[in-house]
């Protein structure tokens, strides 16, 4: 009896794992084995596919074959008993195009109200993603174990921290990788669950801000209790994308180690030009807080986010404020190539009641003013990146009198 060729061959590639699956054509014939050949583009000869010779099952693994993953290959399969079937040719394919991203590895660290998620590719030193290893982004689904209500978080990097969680609560999550450059979405990791800890008696420091004084940076934060010591650590922001990098390590700022005040001062030359993350931890000698939320710190913005300059055109019932670039010493305007929002505070000269306007535009109308009344205005700039959270100091106050009642132009 002639053996029939196997049919419906499927090629599954996940990371560096190459799996072939096929259907037997004739279930009634026993003791049949299967063998594959492969052929590279531009070659005439077929080569035996190692790992897929004389297979008794309907699945084989050819991961050991060192292929150029960007090069098209063709496969063929036949059944063998005493005689052999004809070859069945599988459509040619490019491994990289066919490959799926496998489930990433996930490591969780619990705090009382936060979870730190460390994500790394499931296949270490993968050949398939060798050129794309640093381009992985991740997305995750997280839910409270008790409720099952899912929250999705997209476009995160290899280390991510989720805040505002409840203490002593079990959270579960799963993570998948994506290579946006190749339009590839990966397979979810197994579900990982972790219970947040009991609430820490010492809350983390809050409202961390950096300002510049002379040749120094001044780092300030708020804390609930007195008689504490604090330590500050920094990390290159770009390393969050790549914790595999041996440089990925939070480092101490020497002048901010075991400080007893809610601020520390350190020379500007501690940091080269760049973007950093900063975090602060409190200790009372016995207990230690969890780390604060991280703030982004851009040395360029930090050094040069100066208060805005502005002109006021006074009308009877309003001010028109025109905001310009701040001036450096030497009266040259500072070019600020990052988006800013402006906070404008104004008040009647004879009163302490302040009103506030927040605007993205550089021409702002302050409405509902009384005629022939002196109002004072001050302004400051904020960066629009919530992580950067940087503000200039306020400008000096400028006071102007509104026009008499009949002017509106």
């Amino acid at each position: 009896k002639n053996l029939k060729s196997p049919q419906k061959v499927e090629v599954d590639i996940i990371d560096d794992n190459f799996i072939l699956r096929w259907n037997r054509s004739d279930e009634s014939v026993g003791n049949v084995t299967f063998s594959f050949d492969y052929q590279k583009t531009g070659m005439d000869n077929w080569i035996k596919l190692s790992g897929c010779q004389n297979i008794t099952s309907t699945k084989c693994n050819f991961s050991s074959l060192k292929l150029n993953v960007y090069e098209e290959i063709k496969l063929r399969i036949r059944a063998e008993k005493e005689n052999t079937s004809s070859w069945y040719e599988v459509d040619s394919f490019t491994p990289f195009r066919k490959a799926q991203i496998g489930p990433p590895e996930v490591h969780l660290e619990a705090e009382d109200k936060a979870i730190v998620i460390h994500i790394s590719p499931g296949t270490k030193d993968s050949v398939m993603w060798a050129l794309d290893g640093l381009s992985f982004t991740y997305s995750l689904v997280i839910w409270k174990n008790s409720s099952g209500v899912e929250e999705r978080i997209e476009n995160i990097y290899s280390r991510h921290k989720i805040y505002k969680l409840s203490p002593e609560t079990t959270y579960c999550l799963k993570v998948k990788a994506a290579l946006l450059t190749s339009w590839k979405i990966g397979v979810y990791s197994p579900v990982h669950c972790i219970k947040t800890t009991v609430e820490n008696e010492l809350p983390p420091p809050e409202n961390i801000e950096v300002s510049v004084q002379n040749q120094n940076y001044v780092l300030k934060w708020d804390y609930t209790y007195a008689n504490m010591t604090f330590q500050v650590q920094w990390l290159h922001a770009f390393l969050k994308r790549n914790p595999g990098n041996h440089l990925y390590k939070w480092k101490q700022i020497p002048d901010c180690e075991n400080v007893k005040t809610t601020q520390c001062v350190f020379p500007q030359n501690v940091f080269q030009k760049g973007i950093y993350l900063l975090r602060v931890q409190a200790s009372d000698g016995n207990n230690t807080s969890f780390w604060s939320e991280e703030i982004k710190f851009d040395t360029e913005i930090q050094a040069f986010l100066l208060p805005p300059v502005f002109n006021i055109r006074s009308l009877s019932d309003s001010f028109h404020i025109y905001i310009g670039a701040p001036k450096q010493s030497g009266n040259t305007p500072v070019i600020q190539d990052y988006p800013l929002i402006y906070e404008i505070i104004f008040w009647e000269n004879t009163s302490n009641a302040e009103r506030k306007i927040i605007e993205k535009k550089t021409d702002v109308t302050v409405p509902n003013l009384k005629p022939l009344t002196v109002y004072c205005v001050k302004a400051r700039a904020h960066t629009m990146d919530e992580k950067l959270n940087k503000s200039s100091v306020f400008s000096d106050a400028v006071c102007e009198k509104t026009k008499p009642g009949n002017t509106s132009k």
């Epitope: 705090e111 730190v116 972790i194 008696e201 914790p243 041996h246 990925y248 207990n287 230690t288 969890f290």
Partner: antibody, heavy 123, light 107 residues
């Protein structure tokens, strides 16, 4: 697979120094803290300190700070622990043990241990 | 330094028994607790980290629980190979500290 292989047993006189080695394999050496723990005969476990093999940052148990030196040879993926001014109460098995990833926010448990090196201090 | 107090210090039990070992810390350690098993002449072996997470390859009869200052290791049904000394260890604050150990013996 992860392996930590330590140097052989040592016999030392009081006042002398001993240097124990721990050769790591099967993982990225510079990505994990390496810890040292000792165990006196019939006693419990005592943490000595740890080192970051990537930049040699160290943390010590205050009890050993003045007498212990931790060093690294990245070319051979080996960590060394030297204990000086030995006394009879330093007689113990000394273990190296892998700690958490250096990129973790917090410390981690000791997941792989060397086989131990018996150091005997006797006059 | 954080003190770790393990109890009992020794325990006799039979194969098939359910056994519980407790560990108390002098300060809250926020689940940064590990359990190790040590057999004579061998290095300790990590069983559980993070107070509750079973290491891969460790039989499921071992489980960890607890939070704050109080933690427990449970062996649901003792097997002959489980007779050993068990240590807890905190890794919340340096210096890391261990309990004094619980010797589990055959009754």
């Amino acid at each position: 697979q992860v392996q930590l292989v330590q140097s052989g047993a040592e016999v030392k006189k009081p006042g002398a120094s001993v240097k124990v080695s721990c050769k790591a394999s099967g993982y990225t050496f510079t990505s994990y803290w390496m810890n040292w723990v000792r165990q006196a005969p019939g006693q419990g476990l005592e943490w000595i300190g740890k080192i970051d093999p990537s930049d040699s940052e160290t943390h010590f148990n205050q009890k050993f700070r003045d007498r212990v030196t931790l060093t690294v040879d990245k070319s051979t993926s080996t960590v060394y622990m030297e204990l000086s001014s030995l006394r009879s109460e330093d007689t113990a098995v000394y273990y190296c043990a892998r700690g958490g990833r250096i990129s973790f926010d917090y410390d981690a448990a000791l997941d792989y241990w060397g086989q131990g090196t018996l150091v005997t201090v006797s006059s | 330094d954080i003190q770790m107090t393990q109890s009992p210090s020794s325990l006799s039990a039979s194969v098939g028994d359910r056994v519980t070992i407790t560990c108390k810390s002098s300060e809250v350690i926020y689940n940064r607790l590990a359990w190790y098993q040590q057999k004579p002449g061998n290095a300790p072996k990590l069983l559980i980290s993070g107070a509750t997470t079973l290491e891969s390859g460790v039989p499921s009869r071992f489980s960890g629980s607890g939070s704050g200052k109080d933690y427990t290791l449970t062996i649901s049904s003792l097997q002959p190979e489980d007779f050993a000394t068990y240590y807890c260890q905190q890794y919340w604050n340096k210096p890391f500290t261990f309990g004094q150990g619980t010797k589990l013996e055959i009754k």
